[in-house]
Interface confidence: medium
């Protein structure tokens, strides 16, 4: 049967819903706009969020053939042209990207705090400190360890964006994920076996995936002129 | 420890919708898939669907998709499933079963004790 | 929507190894299938054995593998004990249909 790994899946869900579960760690809802639908250039539609409890999201309309609803799910733009059919992401891959994520933000717990402090987030900054840091992040190349730290950076960006109270911030943020796991991410995944070998590597006999040697990096923090978030893409992207 | 908490049996008309319970406790609800399994006296098993709790994604086996409706509570750790329009094949053990994962492998690992539903006019 | 087929009943000794097999209808079953194997003892006690093919669950014990054979998954019990004797039921991930099972394959320890 097809490697539907290597054949490809909706790295938009993927990002979706690790927000989605980032955001529920710390009791936020997340009623996503209308992310990757909408045009090249357009803001999408702001996301909603709730702390309370009982909040339930709205699922969209199933799609057959698999009846599934979700809050994740956004139609294609219309008259999109139609790519290669993508396969619904086995829950196994949410499940080891949640894992390898909480692993990599409790291995680093002091850092990430630090990091979120030094944010400064504002709607006119994301964007430039989204995109420097994750530049910075693989600028010397990709592994499965920098993608597992892009996830957990954009997660950070989003819990700092509603603890700032800017959660339009969060739709937009899942787009960055999105289009940069698209334009730069996707080949590199597809050529190393696809989210399938990540499942795969991330096991018993493959840990730690985050061999890096951060101590090393310690003593960029003093050279650190051009800022705090350059600083801490810098700090991931040797890892 | 991981415990999934189902209601009793329960005994309805064909037709009238039977709703069942799952509390969970042990775990972080929001971390773990949940899953529901039919067993009908004598046969196998057969997947129904699963839930993701962060954020109420549902997807249902095709076959149940007009059937079954797999709902949360995340105030009470409580997942549900509704069965409409029941008719006599709907008679069966109903599981609900918390999906695990270590180190990229998925398991079925954690059951319910089952509660029987029973359509009887 | 997919079949899958499993042994409807099997019998071995103590100290024998027996393999257990889960075949799908829609062609090899591989790694991406995610094959998932399951034990229910009576009154309706399940344990989840092994996942993603060939990784055994915490606290299962050592006897117990998973594999590819040809185009089908495998649990193999090397040193079958009687308390092994129970229903073994088989589950695969398709990318269309998500999970299913196989109809389980009765074991039985003499």
């Known amino acids: 049967m097809a490697h539907a790994g290597r054949t490809g899946y909706d790295n938009r869900e993927i990002v979706m819903k690790y927000i989605h579960y980032k955001l529920s760690q710390r009791g936020y809802e997340w009623d996503a706009g209308d992310v990757g639908a909408a045009p090249p250039g357009a803001a999408p539609a702001p996301g909603i969020f709730s702390s309370q409890p009982g909040h339930t999201p709205h699922p969209a309309a199933s799609r057959d053939p698999v009846a599934r609803t979700s809050p994740l799910q956004t139609p294609a733009a219309p008259g999109a042209a139609a790519g290669p059919a993508l396969s619904p992401v086995p829950p196994v891959v949410h499940l080891t990207l949640r894992q390898a994520g909480d692993d990599f933000s409790r291995r680093y717990r002091r850092d990430f705090a630090e990091m979120s402090s030094q944010l400064h987030l504002t709607p006119f900054t994301a964007r430039g400190r989204f995109a420097t840091v994750v530049e910075e992040l693989f600028r010397d190349g990709v592994n499965w360890g920098r993608i597992v730290a892009f996830f957990e950076f954009g997660g950070v960006m989003c819990v700092e964006s509603v603890n700032r109270e800017m959660s339009p911030l969060v739709d937009n943020i899942a787009l960055w994920m999105t289009e940069y796991l698209n334009r730069h991410l996707h080949t590199w995944i597809q050529d190393n076996g696809g989210w399938d070998a990540f499942v795969e590597l991330y096991g018993p006999s493959m840990r730690p995936l985050f061999d890096f040697s951060w101590l090393s990096l310690k003593t960029l923090l003093s050279l650190a002129l051009v800022g705090a978030c350059i600083t801490l893409g810098a700090y991931l992207g040797h890892k | 420890q991981v415990q999934l908490q189902q209601s009793g049996p329960q005994l309805v008309r064909p037709g009238a919708s039977v709703k069942i319970s799952c509390k969970a406790s042990g775990y972080s609800f929001t971390s773990y898939w949940m899953h529901w399994v039919k067993q009908r006296p004598g046969q196998g098993l057969e997947w129904i669907g699963m839930?993701?709790?962060?954020?109420?994604?549902?997807r249902l086996n095709q076959k149940f998709k007009d059937k079954a409706t797999l709902t949360v509570d995340k105030s009470s750790s409580t997942a549900y499933m509704q069965l409409s329009r029941p008719t006599f094949e709907d008679s069966a053990v109903y599981y609900c079963?918390?999906?695990?994962?270590?180190?990229?492998?998925?398991?079925?690992?954690?059951w319910g004790q089952g509660t029987l539903v029973t359509v009887s006019a | 929507q997919a079949v899958v087929t499993q042994e409807s009943a099997l019998t071995t000794s103590p100290g024998e190894t027996i393999t257990l097999t889960c075949r799908s209808s829609?062609?090899?079953?591989?790694?991406?299938?995610?094959a998932t194997w399951v034990q229910e003892k009576p009154d309706h006690l399940f344990t989840g054995l092994m996942g993603?093919?060939?990784y055994r669950a915490p606290g299962v014990p050592a006897r117990f593998s998973g594999s590819l054979i040809g185009d089908k998954a495998a649990l193999t019990i090397t040193g079958a004990q009687t308390e092994d004797e129970a229903m073994y039921f088989c589950a695969l991930w398709f990318s269309n249909h998500f999970w299913v099972f196989g109809g389980g394959t009765k074991l039985t320890v003499l």
């Open positions: 839930i993701d709790p962060s954020d109420s994604e549902t």
């Open positions: 079963e918390r999906g695990d994962y270590y180190y990229g492998s998925s398991y079925f690992a954690y």
């Open positions: 829609t062609g090899a079953v591989t790694t991406s299938n995610y």
């Open positions: 993603g093919t060939t």
